[in-house]
């Protein structure tokens, strides 16, 4: 029977008695930076080339005995998870191993850096097909390690790393905190976050997605035919490295941004029990479990978007938080969120020739998050149109006036501290979907984009009575690009996108009480690209 | 994910640039910074990654490393260049006393210095 973890990542159409998806990652090379490995294990024999790279610290303790099977344990198991004959994800992928962890599973930032440099030099000397680098390790936050990962990613390499096994915010660890790296948390057979001893998987906004990482059967270095169960975010990352190899083998031209968006898109959504995570981290942690795409081709027609949360701004009065998209992505909308509800909104602004999403804290606020909606939109030309605070009682409005530009998102930003406390709601006039509406004291920012075949529509869901959460989702075939709250309520904490659903959060109803100001309206902007759909059909 | 400039307070020690013997002063107004792991048991003091500014060539990296060694020797300190980086990041890995950090931060082309630290299998 198929091991639970392989079944979990396999779409139903592949599920037979044996896990045999097409293509197997044969066009892709996966680099593994880990312990030494037992390359003659039946699972990985002939699939893994052991490089001569070794940079490890000495083992701790005078009583440590180097036992070959222990030294090879971690790396052998992971190589098996990625490409093992019986229990591997991408059975066709070839691998190269670099030893950066000693027999106790310990390495150094400097050794890892030199290993990454070795990979880059190998890539320059002998360019091959797509490269995936698996980093099943973690240390404390490291600016230099994150920078090296960024450089390698910008050279076209896909880096996949473990979120860490510290039951903590992954942003406090490297390379997990590097934005360019695909960071993977671990879940178990019940789709619960993995507990390991007193700790467990890391979580938070620096995690891209989760994957099976508990009780994973794979190659054991105890003997050439042995298997063993291992657990951790390394095992989860190995699954994603295998899935990435499969995807890149099917579509070798995929960029890192495209691959990440596809990994997110094809993941199982909302299956993780978020109660395991600390309350303040639940909204930041993606509820996604990695899976292979149901078919290796034909995903190109989709408009892919993801949500990127900023770091917390901190509580000072003028504090701001910035969320950025990857270089190949377009920022299509920007929203903000504050647990205290005290914020001064958000705006899209240019920084280094690229749009970023900036959220503003308010006096007495505990801090804000900026939330960027980052999308893949080829040949896009996007700009931000701003309307300053209006004098008229009807509020501030801004629309996309350029020919062929459509509205993808609305933001509003204000200087006064208590905006909306005693103001009646402002309703959007019907028949004007290309328009953002806000309070008269607020600046309103419209994200307007032109791209071949791009069409968007506005969808609203209003609830007259106060409620902690109001949602509105885009229907099948449409992708959520913008998420905001219609102005007029004092207790809105903010808005953010979760997959294809726009979520508007309000203060706990029990504390605000039911008033005439209780109405909450969530506004979603849903887009699709006819151009991408046509291009996909022409390819097929 | 984490912003490049590191929103997380991994200890950052900025030391003001001052003329120091034969060292060229860094470009006006820029201050190299020192970073170390926030988790104390994972720190590896005595080994440092000196990261140079983005467009620094390999020859300049080697020259900067040699300059650090020469200035350290004048002060009676032994240093060892363990690796010169090029291809991904310009810079070098050096084994030296933490006493020399102030000196190293004033070297030309230095962007930041990070103390080495441990990583672990997950």
């Amino acid at each position: 029977s198929i091991p639970w973890n392989l079944e979990r990542i396999t779409p139903p159409r592949y599920r037979a008695d044996e896990y045999q998806p097409p293509d197997g990652g044969s066009l892709v090379e996966v680099y593994l930076l880990d312990t030494s490995i037992q390359s003659d294990h039946r699972e990985i024999e002939g699939r893994v080339m052991v490089t001569d790279f070794e940079n490890v610290p000495e083992e701790d303790g005078t009583r440590f005995h180097r036992q070959a099977s222990k030294c090879d344990s971690h790396g052998t198991h992971l190589a098996g998870v990625v490409s093992g004959r019986d229990a591997g994800v991408a059975k066709g992928a070839s691998m190269r191993s670099l030893r950066v962890l000693n027999c106790q599973g310990k390495g150094t930032v400097s050794g890892t850096l030199i290993g990454l440099e070795f990979i880059r030099k190998s890539q320059l000397v002998q360019p091959v097909g797509p490269l995936v680098v698996l980093l099943p390790l973690a240390g404390g936050y490291s600016r230099v390690l994150n920078a090296a990962c960024q450089r390698l990613a910008r050279a076209g390499v896909v880096l996949v790393t473990a979120a860490g096994n510290f039951r903590d915010d992954a942003c406090l660890y490297s390379p997990a905190s590097a934005p360019e790296v695909i960071t993977v948390g671990a879940t178990n057979a019940q789709d619960q976050p993995v507990t390991l001893g007193t700790l467990g998987t890391n979580f938070g906004r620096c995690v891209d997605l989760f994957a099976p990482g508990e009780d994973i059967i794979g190659a054991s270095s105890d003997c050439s035919t042995c298997f063993v169960s291992q657990s951790g975010t390394s095992q989860a990352a190995a699954h994603v490295a295998g899935i990435a190899a499969m995807m890149l083998s099917a579509e070798p031209e995929l960029t890192l941004a495209e691959l990440r968006q596809r990994l997110i898109h094809f993941s199982a959504k909302d299956v993780i029990n978020e109660a395991w995570f600390p309350e303040d981290q639940r909204v930041l942690t993606p509820n996604l479990v990695a899976a292979l795409p149901p078919s290796t081709h034909g995903a190109g027609w989709q408009l892919f978007c993801r949500t990127v949360w900023s770091a917390h701004s901190g509580p000072t009065r003028m504090a701001t938080a910035v969320a950025r998209c990857a270089p190949d992505e377009e920022l299509l909308s920007c929203s903000s969120f504050s647990r205290s509800g005290k914020r001064r909104g958000e705006r899209m602004e240019a920084q280094g020739g690229k749009l970023v999403c900036r959220a503003h804290n308010a006096f007495g606020g505990e801090g804000v998050y900026a939330i960027a909606r980052c999308c893949l939109l080829p040949q896009a030309n996007c700009s931000v149109h701003t309307a300053p605070p209006a004098e008229a009682s009807m509020g501030t409005r801004v629309h996309c006036h350029q020919q062929g530009h459509v509205l993808t998102g609305c933001s509003s930003h204000w200087e006064v501290e208590d905006l909306g406390t005693h103001k009646p709601p402002v309703l959007r006039p019907r028949g004007q979907p290309n328009q953002c509406v806000g309070h008269r004291e607020a600046s309103i920012h419209a994200s307007c984009c032109h791209a071949p075949g791009l069409e968007c529509k506005v969808k609203e869901h209003g609830i007259p009575a106060p409620q902690e959460q109001v949602t509105v989702a885009c229907e099948e075939g449409w992708t959520l690009t913008g998420c905001s709250a219609l102005p007029g309520t004092s207790h809105v904490l903010g808005a953010y996108a979760v997959d294809n659903t726009c979520v508007v959060r309000s203060r706990d109803v029990s504390t605000t009480g039911s008033t005439s100001e209780g109405a909450v309206t969530a506004v979603a902007i849903c887009c699709r690209s006819r151009h991408l759909a046509q291009a996909s059909q022409e390819l097929q | 994910q984490e912003d490049e400039d590191g929103d997380y307070e991994e200890l950052v020690l900025a030391l003001r640039s001052e003329e120091d013997g034969l060292a060229e002063a860094p470009e006006h107004g820029t201050t190299a910074t020192f970073h170390r792991c926030a988790k104390d048991p994972w720190r590896l003091p005595g080994t440092y990654v000196v990261v140079l500014k983005e467009e620094t060539h390999l020859s300049q990296s080697e020259r900067t490393a040699r300059r650090l060694q020469a200035q350290a020797a004048r002060r009676g300190y032994l240093t060892k260049i363990l690796h010169v980086f090029h291809g991904l990041l310009p810079g070098f890995l050096v084994k030296m006393s933490g006493d020399l950090l102030e000196l190293a931060l004033k070297l030309p082309h230095v962007d930041y210095i990070e103390e080495d630290s441990s990583v672990f299998a997950q």
């Epitope: 029977s1 099977s69 344990s73 310990k106 001893g197 054991s220 042995c226 298997f227 657990s231 | -």
Partner: antibody, heavy 130, light 107 residues
């Protein structure tokens, strides 16, 4: 689905020997520690011995040390318990069980996380009597 | 060796009752404790591992708690199928010991 089937039980005189076997079906047999547990008539459960995946580590309850030997044959997907110098107090139903557990790493190195005995055989009866 | 003591030895209860079985270790075992259910003539069945984690396929009316030396197994609402003998088991560096068992019978 993993299945465990014990055999080899029977009546034996005090001082005699017996070899119990446990045949496993399902490929995960070789991936886990395995245990023998016994239950004397009308009494509770008593753990007897366990063995690591590759047979390199074995542990025993004090009362059987030096008399019983646990072993496994990965190629045959089988677990064994060689019982020598049998005593009347060894009379029991003997179960083989899979020890579900997993290895994981922390900054301290390699750790073992034990879940419990999640798959059991139906048991084989050993009677030691003259 | 670590001794495990279960209480009570026998427990009479009715369908729908909430019942609690206690297990005490002679020294701290952290959370390394499992609970099993055994019916006459059958092999034991794993219910709870690591003190509080529910084994896959086990009904949610079973729950475990505790750490160190004191542990409890709770059945929130007894069902007819739950009348059986329950054992706790500690794990400590690859050697195990069971409690003497608690027989749960119909009142």
């Amino acid at each position: 689905e993993v299945q465990l089937v014990e055999s080899g039980g029977g009546l034996v005189q005090p001082g005699g020997s017996l070899r119990l076997s446990c045949a496993a079906s399902g490929i995960t047999f070789s991936s886990y520690w395995m245990s023998w547990v016994r239950q004397a008539p009308g009494k509770g459960l008593e753990w007897v011995a366990n063995i690591k995946q590759d047979g390199s580590e074995k542990y025993y309850v004090d009362s059987v040390k030096g008399r019983f030997t646990i072993s496994r044959d990965i190629a045959k997907n089988s677990l064994y318990l060689q019982m020598n110098s049998l005593r009347a107090e060894d009379t029991a139903v003997y179960y083989c069980a899979r020890d579900r557990g997993t290895y994981y790493y922390t900054e301290g190195g390699y750790n073992y996380y034990y879940y419990g005995m999640d798959v059991w055989g139906q048991g084989t009866t050993v009677t030691v009597s003259s | 060796d670590i001794q495990m003591t279960q209480s009570p030895s026998t427990l009479s209860a009715s369908v729908g009752d909430r019942v609690t079985i206690t297990c005490r270790a002679s020294q701290s075992i952290s959370s390394w404790l499992a609970w099993y259910q055994q019916k006459p003539g059958k092999a034991p069945k794993l219910l709870i591992y690591k003190a509080s984690s529910l084994e896959s396929g086990v009904p949610s009316r079973f729950s475990g708690s505790g750490s160190g030396t004191e542990f409890t197994l709770t059945i929130s609402s007894l069902q007819p199928d739950d009348f059986a003998t329950y054992y706790c088991q500690q794990y400590n560096s690859y050697s195990y010991t069971f409690g003497q068992g608690t027989k749960l019978e119909i009142k």
